[in-house]
């Protein structure tokens, strides 16, 4: 699942991770586009095991899912793309 | 010290059954996902399955459905491989190998079990 | 099952030489791979995962590369400790796959 966040917090990533995790470990992935309180794009991962880690916007692998998962959203085949916008 | 020790050779005759031992020690158990993985002589390797010792989820590569059954007792931090129905091409070594949550590939290995199967 | 092809089951070279071996995936996946160094009679270590990060206490002169379908591992100058088989794997889905093996032999 893949869902767009547009918040007014600061950073929540102080470490970023470009290490490739398997789709199969993965829950979610939120992403919080750069503005308001911080200056960067930030990409967390949501884990099965309940872990989150921050993955580096630029590591080739999730560029990669998230693509994939952008695709699958607009031909309405399962793992939809949600977008909330948090005040 | 991460070790992962390995029940000692077996020699089985052909359609019995077999189950072999790995003992792990000197991590947390549950933070590494065990997989067992074969490598018939002086080939290749190829991938069986994997046990979550969190929770006993196992995920197994279609080829050994059937043939392997993982499982895993925490309390002895030990996951376990049954074979069964053996033939002459399940005469291999098998080893055991852990990765955890941050490298997902398999950075601790057993030392090996071998298999022979033979009447 | 994803295929990963070795084209190289055997490589000669010398001590001192860079010696590049490949891997090639059957599909896309991404940079989910690792390489394993396996000495006759032990079991296989981990040098690479995720394509290119040096597993720790891998020495320097190991390094790995690409993404996608196609693999590069590289040694910069072999020692005479790095003659054994290397296995590229990948785990970008199950079953994870290995490729054939590629044995590094001194000329």
């Known amino acids: 699942v893949l869902e767009v966040y547009y918040t007014s917090l600061r950073c929540r990533c102080v470490q970023e991770s470009s290490v490739f995790i398997p789709r199969r470990f993965i829950d979610r992935i939120q992403i919080l586009p750069r503005g308001n309180g911080c200056p960067r794009k930030e990409i967390i991962v949501w884990k099965k095991n309940k872990s989150i880690v921050c993955v580096d916007p630029q590591a080739e692998w999730i560029q990669r899912m998230m693509e994939v998962l952008r695709k699958r959203s607009s031909s309405t085949l399962p793992v939809p793309v949600f977008k909330r916008k948090i005040p | 010290e991460v070790q992962l020790q390995q029940s000692g050779p077996e020699l089985v005759k052909p359609g019995a059954s077999v189950k072999i031992s790995c003992k792990a020690s000197?991590?947390?158990?549950?933070?590494?996902?065990m997989n067992w993985v074969r490598q018939s002589h002086g080939k290749s390797l190829e991938w069986i399955g994997d046990i979550n010792p969190n929770n006993g989820d196992t995920t197994y590569n279609q080829k050994f459905k059937g043939k392997a059954t993982l499982t895993v007792d925490t309390s002895s931090s030990t996951v376990y491989m049954e074979l069964r129905s053996l033939t002459s091409e399940d005469s291999a070594v098998y080893y055991c190998?852990?990765?955890?949550?941050?490298?997902?590939?398999?950075?601790?290995w057993g030392q090996g079990t071998s298999v022979t199967v033979s009447s | 099952d994803y295929v990963m092809t070795q084209s190289h089951k055997f490589m000669s070279t010398s001590v001192g030489d860079r010696v590049s071996i490949t891997c090639k995936a059957s599909q896309d996946v991404s940079t989910g791979v690792a390489w394993y160094q396996q000495n006759p009679g032990q079991s296989p270590k981990l040098l690479i995962y995720s394509a290119s990060h040096r597993y720790t206490g891998v020495p320097d002169r190991f390094t790995g590369s690409g993404s996608g379908t196609d693999f590069t591992f590289t040694i910069s100058s072999v020692q005479a400790e790095d003659l054994a088989v290397y296995y590229c794997q990948q785990y970008y889905t199950t079953p994870w796959t290995f490729g054939g093996g590629t044995k590094l032999e001194i000329k």
């Open positions: 000197g991590y947390t158990f549950t933070d590494y996902y």
């Open positions: 190998a852990g990765y955890d949550e941050d490298h997902y590939a398999m950075d601790y």
